[in-house]
């Protein structure tokens, strides 16, 4: 029977800036029950505070809710491991919240063949970004990543949006289903997942484009 | 602990290309994001660009664009840089650096001396 | 890019003294966070750098209180109050607020 073995902080993500949750993965037991306390204090002060939420964010987790996430402090935390053998602490981590962010993916991705008179028919589609962000603060800037395949294709076609919510596509493969899917990252964060796909038939009269891809 | 491991030194001829590694241990390496920063001798200090491992994200100084690239090899938990066309101007010695949740360096590695001679 | 200016360039002081870096910045370093990223790292001979000061004026873990930050917008200060031997290296400023990320030309703290 041993102390426990040195636990890890090994992520923390906040989806908006306005919460935030750490994990931390534990050493080894030393074949005894062993608890966790994971201890913080903010820049400029020499007060420790115990984690308010260690419910939300799941096993081995520490959850910030509003009242307790500032954007403007950084969090130095470690992580306790106790057990009737003795102690062992994680390394302390630096913690600002900007560079935490990890958002929802978009929202209300359509997509649509257009096939005007004058010019060559193109793929267009646009998308919302996640509720939770609040672009008008200009706290976040956020970039968009589109990628889409023919339904049956094994390998992925990707296109960097920078921050338009909007996009055109104009070389497509006539006849093909294709499946379409955006995320999004800011400036300083993390990419969101994935968001659902959107399906879309492109018509087998679509005419060819020798250019790639266009920005609005 | 966290550690970053840096070979010494590279010998490289002119209008070449190196590839330099820095070995992470001591925490999981696609949890945080590692840096790249170059050191001419005497001289001060220059932040090259930034790879998150978990997706191989990076995002580059536009004076490093087509000098240095930057890839991980999550296996090894390694990061690599390389630089290529070297010149007598890339001498120097060159860091890996990495932050914790923050956009400053907590850890650095020991450094790899490049040497750009024929 | 952000250029950052340090003074001076070589700082011999006696040991015991106090010394003050200064260190100037091309663009006002408030990041639209509202956080100020300007950090201060010391590199001592055949060493890596070291993370003294992060965010203006806080202390990196195991930095010894004599070490201290100040400033804003434009104008950073790095005071060490009493030099001890250890103190002796390469100072360098840095800024993390606009990318690129950009560092003084360092200031060498010698024995005088």
């Known amino acids: 029977q041993l102390p426990p073995g040195k636990p890890e902080i090994f992520k923390c993500r906040s989806p908006n800036k306005e919460t935030f949750t750490c994990w931390w993965r534990p050493g080894t037991d030393g074949g005894l029950p062993t608890n966790y306390s994971l201890t913080y204090h903010r820049e400029g002060e020499t007060l420790m505070h115990e984690c308010p939420d260690y419910i939300t964010g799941g096993p081995n987790s520490c959850h910030f809710g509003k009242q307790y996430t500032s954007m403007w402090r950084t969090y130095v935390m470690m992580v306790n491991a106790t057990n009737q053998m003795g102690s062992s602490f994680s390394d302390e981590l630096y913690v600002d919240v900007t560079y935490i962010v990890q958002p929802d993916p978009p929202l209300e991705l359509t997509v649509e063949v257009k096939q005007p008179e004058d010019r060559k028919p193109y793929l267009w589609m646009k998308w919302s970004p996640p509720t939770l962000i609040d672009l008008k603060t200009g706290w976040f800037t956020l970039l968009y990543e589109i990628r889409l395949k023919p339904e049956k294709a094994a390998e992925w076609e990707t296109h960097f949006a920078g921050q338009q919510t909007e996009f055109k596509i104009l070389s497509l493969h006539p006849g093909q289903k294709y499946l379409v899917q955006v995320r999004c990252k800011p400036d300083h964060g993390y990419w969101s997942a994935w968001s659902p796909a959107t399906f879309i038939q492109i018509p087998s009269d679509f005419i060819m484009n020798d250019h790639h891809h266009h920005h609005h | 602990q966290v550690q970053l491991q840096q070979p010494g030194a590279e010998l490289v001829r002119p209008g070449t290309s190196v590839k330099l590694s820095c070995k992470a241990s001591g925490y999981t390496f696609t949890s945080f994001w590692m840096h790249w920063v170059k050191q001419r001798p005497g001289q001060g200090l220059e932040w090259i660009g930034v790879?998150?491992?978990?997706?191989?994200?990076?995002n580059y100084n536009q004076k490093f664009k087509g000098k240095a690239t930057l890839t991980v090899d999550t296996s090894s938990s390694t990061a690599y840089m390389q630089l290529s066309s070297l010149t007598s101007e890339d001498s120097a010695v060159y860091y890996c650096?990495?932050?914790?949740?923050?956009?400053?360096?907590?850890?650095w590695g020991q450094g790899t001396l490049v040497t750009v001679s024929a | 890019d952000v250029v950052m200016t340090q003074t001076p360039l070589s700082l011999p002081v006696s040991l015991g003294d106090q010394a003050s870096i200064s260190c100037r910045s091309s663009q006002r370093l408030v990041h639209s966070n509202g956080n100020t990223y300007l950090h201060w790292y010391l590199q001592k001979p055949g060493q890596s750098p070291k993370l003294l000061i992060y965010k203006v004026s806080n202390r990196f873990s195991g930095v010894p209180d004599r070490f201290s930050g100040s400033g804003s917008g434009t104008d950073f200060t790095l005071k060490i109050s009493r030099v001890e031997a250890e103190d002796l290296g390469v100072y360098f400023c840095s800024q993390s607020t606009h990318v690129p990320w950009t560092f003084g030309g360092g200031t060498k703290l010698e024995i005088k």
């Open positions: 650096a990495r932050g914790d949740y923050s956009n400053w360096f907590t850890y």
């Open positions: 790879i998150d491992p978990s997706d191989t994200y990076t």
